[in-house]
Amino acid sequence: IVLRPSRVHNSEENTMRALTLKDILNGTFSYKTFFPNWISGQEYLHQSADNNIVLYNIETGQSYTILSNRTMKSVNASNYGLSPDRQFVYLESDYSKLWRYSYTATYYIYDLSNGEFVRGNELPRPIQYLCWSPVGSKLAYVYQNNIYLKQRPGDPPFQITFNGRENKIFNGIPDWVYEEEMLATKYALWWSPNGKFLAYAEFNDTDIPVIAYSYYGDEQYPRTINIPYPKAGAKNPVVRIFIIDTTYPAYVGPQEVPVPAMIASSDYYFSWLTWVTDERVCLQWLKRVQNVSVLSICDFREDWQTWDCPKTQEHIEESRTGWAGGFFVSTPVFSYDAISYYKIFSDKDGYKHIHYIKDTVENAIQITSGKWEAINIFRVTQDSLFYSSNEFEEYPGRRNIYRISIGSYPPSKKCVTCHLRKERCQYYTASFSDYAKYYALVCYGPGIPISTLHDGRTDQEIKILEENKELENALKNIQLPKEEIKKLEVDEITLWYKMILPPQFDRSKKYPLLIQVYGGPCSQSVRSVFAVNWISYLASKEGMVIALVDGRGTAFQGDKLLYAVYRKLGVYEVEDQITAVRKFIEMGFIDEKRIAIWGWSYGGYVSSLALASGTGLFKCGIAVAPVSSWEYYASVYTERFMGLPTKDDNLEHYKNSTVMARAEYFRNVDYLLIHGTADDNVHFQNSAQIAKALVNAQVDFQAMWYSDQNHGLSGLSTNHLYTHMTHFLKQCFSLSD
């Protein structure tokens, strides 16, 4: 199945050129998406190409500038946020990245009524997080791990918390592990729908062991970076949730929300908070052994000024075959009655589907069903539920948007996107305005991405927001590789794969094969999306075949495949890559003396284990920032899939699944090991231990470190990395430079 859109080829073949590595490193063929910044049912803001902030009204068809690029430039603003009452804009500058989501910045408040910056009671700097209330123009912000509240931008701040302390107590922002592995946000505070209450999390990291690594910088002595980072089995952060009345914050102060008794009896996590109304809130909790999750609906008691979470409003979600949820436990989407909700969880056949919960989880009404999975609930209105799934034509790597009419009985289902631009668009996400009056569809491929605006009642396309015309023109004279997505059936397991083939691919010839692997639990690599990246170049210019395979442990194909790796990481993921390679060899066009594998992060772990599998299939391979032992990785992630590294739990497999245990098996492969020394996520320790084991086994290997670089190896390191890996692969495959 060729997924690239067909193009009329110029009759003069010599006008077409292959991709170059420079094209990739320069981002020559990157695409744009358009996500409206919705401010009402029919209005959105967008930053124009010349950096003006423009308001668009879909119904009047009018647009106008609310903030000029001159004002933005006056404070070097790189981001903005309009207050819901439309009186003020915060301007964000001095962006300084911390971890994956977190950053600090300087904030200025601009008064739109008088065209001036608010003077007096200016915000401190740098701020860790800042947001407007959902109504009006109250401000909540986090500074030096404490939360502050302003009733108006020019008012003095009210300090809500006082115990915040660097690396010890975090208020309103997550610590490292909650940011990366649980919340996936830079914030841990949530306004109630009308801004009456502010809920926040407090994380106590006092007893967490610290990871320390050198940051070399330019000084005579390196700095030491210290991060409270719980590795598997270590002491975890202690979390508490508080809610404060923002109208009278000093009246009773923050009130703690009680933890369900069945959760509080042992180590636990807080997983998410969802406001239902101004006086009803829903909290989700998770046992440290992550197969039991409790959703708790709590109500404000006016008389006591406290939050009450009755046992009758506790809903338990338990997995008997794996962990609770997919990557995370799903969050509820409440209906208009403010008590019932829609939620995605496994049905009796082991497929993740939308369920409607009115009283108990046991009495849940299943809304979607089939041997496919519902992936995200975008919006629930009075009469419609919008969600995405991979149902259409049974391709797990696609995403289409569906509408279920919940106002009528029986509910009817309509695929909004399936037939819109069928060849070009098979992988969508959506962004909805208030009450789903309008929505934007963002198509990621397999053709060139396109963003469109639609009417929320009729689904009619109103206009194209971004169609990447320049990219389309730039690609006209490029020989792109061909891509196909197919499946292998092996021992009752379906292995979906994507194969990227050289432009003049000829089945009767033999090609070197590169396997690109990630393979982590609940991940998906085989997706119908557009990309012009390093592997596109390797196929286009260097004549390699590249394959990506989704094996056991990967997502959106049911629990049998997903939970197959439970408590056994590093076994089936590797087996399935090897099985796929054997099948590819059988296809007849792979040169079996020139097969390589590479991966990053979890993929670096899998590629290392595949190289050390002793099969003799791989000539060479690359591991970038690999995990080498699950004892070195974060508790929240690792224990979800592996349990605890204790004798009475799963220590044996922790020990058996290390890369170091297989050091001897690297003797007959060419191995390139790469890691950033300032990797806060997968610590350099992982590669240091692989290198030590290889040296101790007297096994030759190649290595590259990137000083002061984190898990992303960004900036100039990226260019160096891909150039270095290209040389390594070309040498391995005996391709001339």
Epitope: G41, L55, N57, T60, I66, R86, L112
Partner: nanobody
């Protein structure tokens, strides 16, 4: 320049009422979110009231329960009904979109409340 014309201002005694009008002409559609703003002598311009695209209204605390913003789509006009006026309401009143069109304001209409 913004194509909005304010009118209806004048001199009124404390406790009295006025109704301000804002007529939109040319390319401005009154169905956009609209706002009233005011500037008293020696102070910065401040927001008074907003009517959103779907007809919801918001008011500054200082005018709540005294002022009412409304619109007439057919006449392409926005109104501000001001009751129980106080001397501190004395200002030049402007109408604009909400948020306002950047750097673009009309002449306004003067409201003076005597005690």
């Amino acid at each position: 320049q913004v194509q909005l014309q304010e009118s209806g201002g004048g001199l009124v005694q404390a406790g009295g009422s006025l109704r301000l009008s804002c007529a939109a002409s040319g390319s401005i559609d009154i169905r956009n979110a609209m706002g009233w703003y005011r500037q008293a002598p020696g102070t910065r311009r401040e927001w008074v009231a907003t009517i959103t695209t779907d007809g919801r209204t918001n008011y500054a605390d200082s005018v709540k329960a005294r002022f009412t913003i409304s619109r007439d789509n057919a006449k392409n006009t926005v109104y501000l009904q001001m009751n129980s006026l106080k001397p501190e309401d004395t200002a030049v009143y402007y109408c604009n979109l909400a948020p306002p069109i950047f750097g673009s304001w009309g002449q306004g209409t003067q409201v003076t409340v005597s005690s």
